[in-house]
Interface confidence: low
């Protein structure tokens, strides 16, 4: 054996966003012939030596970060990427609107605005069919998600959630869906490139808006991953996915 055992994958089925009281299954997948799996909840003493954890009814206490690893002989694998299991519906839904409106011409700009009645400092925007959200710090009780140079790929159904960085795995219910319609274009999402362009996130302290732009101006399933926003004056680039920027009080 040269080097460590490769890390397994950990996924939540059907989704890592789980409404309270709904079921979810966590599944750890390693190579064939694994002797033992260990699935653990981080920052707690909970673990189980099985590859599958079935949660029949999601609870607040079950939300959090999970990871798994496996053992072959006396060797332990590298741990899986952490999975964030989020309980949704803990708080009332935010509202999602498009400015100046949900119908936008190709090449134009639109800002999706998520607004909550709570004093939350974090927001997540989802496009239906995309695997991961965009997360954004708030501007008082709302967050803006500008989409620069709209293309047909931006058409679709969007929802947003709000939550607190102090309790980042307890989310609101999803907003009512917002249908974004892009007019005046013949380009369809099916003709988009398979390689995702690298996203650039810029956080402007003055407006607390996260500007997401892409090198070839698409906003696709492949590029819809979590983005960290850092203050402009920071020298560090945007950090890894799943790290939150928390606005100071």
């Amino acid at each position: 054996q040269s080097g460590p055992l490769p890390k397994p994958s950990l996924q939540a089925l059907p989704s890592s966003l789980v409404p309270l009281e709904k079921p979810v299954t966590l599944r750890c997948q390693g190579p064939p012939g694994v002797d033992l799996y260990r699935l653990e909840k981080l920052s707690s003493s909970r673990y189980q030596d099985q590859a599958v954890l079935f949660i029949p009814a999601m609870k607040r206490s079950l939300a959090g970060r999970y990871r798994c690893s496996y053992q072959n002989g006396s060797l332990w694998s590298l741990p899986s990427d952490q999975l964030e299991l989020v309980a949704t519906g803990v708080f009332a839904k935010p509202s999602l609107s498009a400015q100046p409106g949900p119908a936008v011409s190709s090449g134009g700009d639109v800002t999706l605005q998520c607004q909550t009645r709570y004093g939350f400092d974090q927001f997540a925007l989802y496009k239906e069919g995309d695997p991961a959200p965009y997360k954004n710090p708030e501007r008082w009780y709302r967050a803006s998600f500008p989409i620069i140079t709209v293309t047909a790929a931006h058409s679709g159904t969007y929802r947003c959630y709000s939550f607190s960085s102090r309790d980042p795995y307890l989310w609101s219910a999803p907003s009512d869906p917002l249908e974004l319609v892009v007019t005046g274009t013949s380009v369809t999402p099916s003709r988009l490139p398979t390689e995702p362009p690298s996203p650039v996130a810029e956080f402007s302290e003055a407006t607390a808006e996260l500007t997401v732009s892409f090198t070839n101006e698409v906003f696709t399933t492949e590029t819809s991953r979590s983005i960290t926003a850092s203050p402009k004056e920071s020298d560090s680039p945007a950090g890894p996915a799943r790290q939150y920027y928390t606005k100071g009080n």
Epitope: Q115, G119, R166
Partner: antibody, heavy 118, light 107 residues
């Protein structure tokens, strides 16, 4: 049963501050938002702001941002609202009210009548 | 802030009458509207949340409906103990705002 206890009345001088209390019982204090509202005779209800006792997250109505400060004492399950630089415009009944996962305020205190007078 | 315009301001009715109060929001508030009852000398009580959901223990003569900007609160058969001021409230966006109230008086 759920109860939110507020003192009946406070008499304060113009320019002074007052700290209103709201003692919660009959439920898990840290699981529900606590709201504060103002009601002047014939002027309906105004929402001042809210605080979540578990995290101290607050959200204020801009109109009251420089007037009210919301705090909680988890050990005594009590929410507080301090009103500063009082004027006659602040004379009103102030209510605390709780809301849970959803925003509607399902339990209200009896209200504290604040009179600002020299 | 969203303005909630509530009508009428006053209602003088007889026991047994059907009463309807309307609330119009200055912009769409989805179904995020609650209705409260405030009896003389008391604090408000929640009757309806999410526009049409009756709160626990509220008699079924109280109903709510509406979506978007137009909302209606109905008392199907008014009783003497319904003497109160009724308020609508939107909680779609912060700050939550209330209608001006409707004072219900019994003949």
């Amino acid at each position: 049963q759920v109860q939110l206890q507020q003192p009946g009345a406070e008499l304060v001088k113009p320019g002074a501050s007052v700290k209103l209390s709201c003692k919660a019982s009959g439920y898990t204090f840290t699981s529900y938002w606590m709201h504060w509202l103002k009601q002047r005779p014939g002027q309906g209800l105004e929402w001042i702001g809210m605080i979540h006792p578990n995290s101290d997250i607050t959200n204020y109505n801009e109109k009251f941002k420089n007037k009210a400060t919301l705090t909680v004492d988890k050990s005594s399950s009590t929410a507080y609202m301090q009103l500063s630089s009082l004027t006659s415009e602040d004379s009103a009944v102030y209510y605390c009210a709780r809301s849970g996962d959803y925003y509607a305020m399902d339990y209200w205190g009896q209200g504290t009548s604040v009179t600002v007078s020299s | 802030s969203i303005v909630m315009t509530q009508t009428p301001k006053f209602l003088l009715v007889s026991a047994g009458d059907r009463v309807t109060i309307t609330c119009k929001a200055s912009q769409s508030v989805s179904n995020d509207v609650a209705w409260y009852q405030q009896k003389p000398g008391q604090s408000p009580k929640l009757l309806i949340y999410y526009a049409s959901n009756r709160y626990t223990g509220v008699p079924d003569r109280f109903t709510g409906s509406g979506y978007g900007t137009d909302f209606t609160f109905t008392i199907s058969t008014v009783q003497a103990e319904d003497l109160a001021v009724y308020f609508c409230q939107q909680d779609y966006s912060s700050p939550p705002t209330f209608g001006g109230g409707t004072k219900l008086e019994i003949k």
